[in-house]
Structure formats: C-alpha cells, structure tokens
C-alpha cells in the first residue's frame, strides 16, 4: 500500500507536545518506528512519517520533489519525496538534489565544469504516452554556472524556485524555465482543476503572493464554469 511505502521515509516535522505553534520545520532524519519528543514533563511519541501532499515541486522543500510515491497506486496522490543524489535515475531536474541536475536520465553534478555556454535542450513533446516524463517533456540542459552563485533575476534561466531571487518563482516559459514574478493582488492566476494539468502549460504562471489565494473573480459572470477568470485575491 501507499502507507507502507511512506512509512519507510524520514520524519517530517515534530509537532509541539501540547499544541500551539512549532518553531521552524525540522530537518529530515532517520527514523525508528516512532520518535520521542518532549511533552510537558513526560515524553510522547509521533508516527515516523508525515506525508506532505503537493501538486508542484515548489510546494516541497529544496531537498525534495513532488511525485506519486508508487507507480500505478493511489492515483491522484502526489507527495514530497526526498531528492535523488548524484548518479541516481531521474526524469527532470527537480528530482535531483541541489547542486545536481538531470541529464540523460541520471542526476549529475552541476559544478562549474559541467556548465559551459548557453542552454542546450532536447525537447520531446509527449502528452500522455508511455515515454512521457513527469512534467510532460524530457530535456537535456547545459546552464551557465553563474546561476548557482547568485539568485536569478527576472528572466534568468532556473531549475527550481530556490534558484530565483526573492519575489520570483521558477516557471515554464516555452520549453525552458525562467524566473518570473510571484503574482500580486488582482493579477490573473491559474487554478488547476485536475491533477497534472499544469504539465501542459507552455507559459506557466507563478503562484499568488503572501496573503493571496487564486479564486474566481467575483464580477466575472460567464456561462461556462471552466472559462471563469481566476485572480489573486486577499484571504
């Protein structure tokens, strides 16, 4: 079952013993069947895995990627999975741990020796066939090493949102990914009705900024529900 796959994973965050807000998220560590954490003047235990559902890699941590944990099982459930280290198999950049990228199906180091010249890509458009990658296309990419030293500005090529400066996210633009501005109040946003639909977007939008959510525009009355305009609105 999905649960048995998940329970082999690392601890996510420990909850506070008696409720209230925890501090910052804990880092992943190896887990025994249960983990002790302080609770008042005694110790309590928490199950050793907290699945974190996601729709896109950016919702996960920088050391994770978003995918279905089992092939063919629990359709529709995607969770954050631990990133893959060098020489492990991959289908896209986000699957590889920071400092690596996906080349010819293998995570390879993105150190300076590997990054010379501009972007070079091989695109295979494949929507829904057996060879399709997790985000709808495969690519071979060579990037300038400088993007790993400074945060990308708007328009810079990126692999993941953590490559971009504050206020920007890494989103698809044609067949590459570039840093784009996080959406502001009133800007049009994309609400994904079905799982995986964002994989078909050629011009992907960022998510809505802090305190905003993507909702149907109140004054936008149209007969078709699917064609209603969504904008970033205050909670």
């Amino acid at each position: 079952t999905l649960n048995s796959v998940l329970n082999s994973n690392a601890i996510k965050n420990l909850p506070p013993p008696l409720g209230g807000a925890a501090g910052h998220p804990g880092s992943a560590v190896s887990a025994a069947p249960g983990i002790l954490y302080p609770g008042g003047n005694k110790y309590q235990t928490i199950d050793n895995y907290q699945p974190y559902p996601c729709a896109e890699d950016e919702e996960c941590g920088t050391d994770e990627y978003c995918a279905s944990p089992t092939r063919g099982g629990d359709a529709g459930v995607q969770i954050c999975l631990a990133c893959r280290k060098r020489r492990k198999r991959c289908m896209r950049h986000a699957m590889c741990c920071p400092g690596n990228y996906c080349k010819n199906g293998i995570c390879v180091s993105s150190d300076q020796n590997h990054f010379r010249g501009e972007i070079e890509e091989t695109i295979t458009e494949s929507f829904g066939n057996d060879h399709s990658t997790l985000d709808g296309y495969s690519r071979r990419t060579t990037l300038s090493s400088k993007m790993y030293h400074t945060k990308g500005q708007e328009g810079s090529v990126c692999l993941r949102s953590s490559d971009c400066a504050s206020g920007l996210c890494c989103a698809r633009h044609f067949w590459s990914k570039i840093c784009k501005p996080v959406l502001k109040e009133g800007q049009v946003c994309t609400k994904h009705r079905r799982k995986g639909s964002h994989g078909l977007e050629i011009f992907q939008r960022c998510y809505c900024g802090e305190g905003l959510s993507c909702r149907i525009q109140k004054d936008h009355h149209q007969a078709s529900n699917s064609s209603r305009l969504h904008t970033c609105q205050r909670h």
Epitope: P25, G26, E59, T62, D63, K191
Partner: nanobody, 125 residues
C-alpha cells in the same frame, strides 16, 4: 501570534458522523499543506489526512479511506475533516497542522510547522 483552533469534536455513536474544523489565525504567511492527525491513548500520533496547497493532491491514511474527507477554504484559512461511518477505533484526540511559510521561503524539507491544541473525538459502540 499564530493560532490554530480546532472545533467539532465530541461524543458520537458508532456509524455516526462528525465534522471537524480548524481555523488558522494570526501571522502573515502563505498556508501550504494542511493536515489532520490523531493520537489515541498509548498510541503514536498518526496522520489521518492531508491536502496540498492547491487542493489537487489529497492523502488519506488507509484506515480512513472512503470514510473521511478533508477539504480547505483558503478564504477562511480553514481546513475541515468530514468523518462518516465512525468506528470505536477512531476515538482519539484530533489535531490539525499546517505548513505556514513567509513569501519566498522554502525549507529544505516541507512539513507541518504549526499545530492546534487538539479536539477530542469519542466513538461509542
């Protein structure tokens, strides 16, 4: 100060239903995943259900699949847990938890960093 307040718990007969709510207040951050956990006496605290930021990916523990439904309302910063066909083994304290992040913040490992105080659910057989 961030607060998560659960409500909707109580005593119900086996086969009955309850709807838990959890409201997030205070703090200026984006709410990413939201989840419900439970802890029965002498047991580990375990995940019941969780929902992604967009609501398009939902996880359920095997023990509650087909009986419980998680949903969220971002406008109200609220997460719900509809519990149907309740069994005596569902008796526990139910906690809600969320991942709250400042704009542009991305931790190394995503997880639930704000937790409620819990609400008791008791199912009598």
């Amino acid at each position: 100060e961030v607060q998560l307040v659960e409500s909707g718990g109580g005593l119900v007969q086996a086969g009955g239903s309850l709807r838990l709510s959890c409201v997030v207040s205070g703090g200026t951050f984006n709410v990413y995943a939201m989840g419900w956990f439970r802890q029965a006496p002498g047991r580990l605290r375990e995940i019941v259900a969780a929902i992604s930021r967009t609501g398009s990916s939902i996880y359920y523990a095997d023990s509650v699949k087909g009986r419980f439904t998680i949903s969220r309302d971002d406008a109200k910063k609220t997460v719900y847990l509809q519990m149907n066909s309740l069994k005596s083994e569902d008796t526990a304290v139910y906690y809600c938890a969320v991942d709250g992040r400042a704009n542009g913040e991305r931790p190394a490992v995503a997880g639930y960093n704000y937790w409620g105080q819990g609400t008791q659910v008791t199912v009598s057989s």
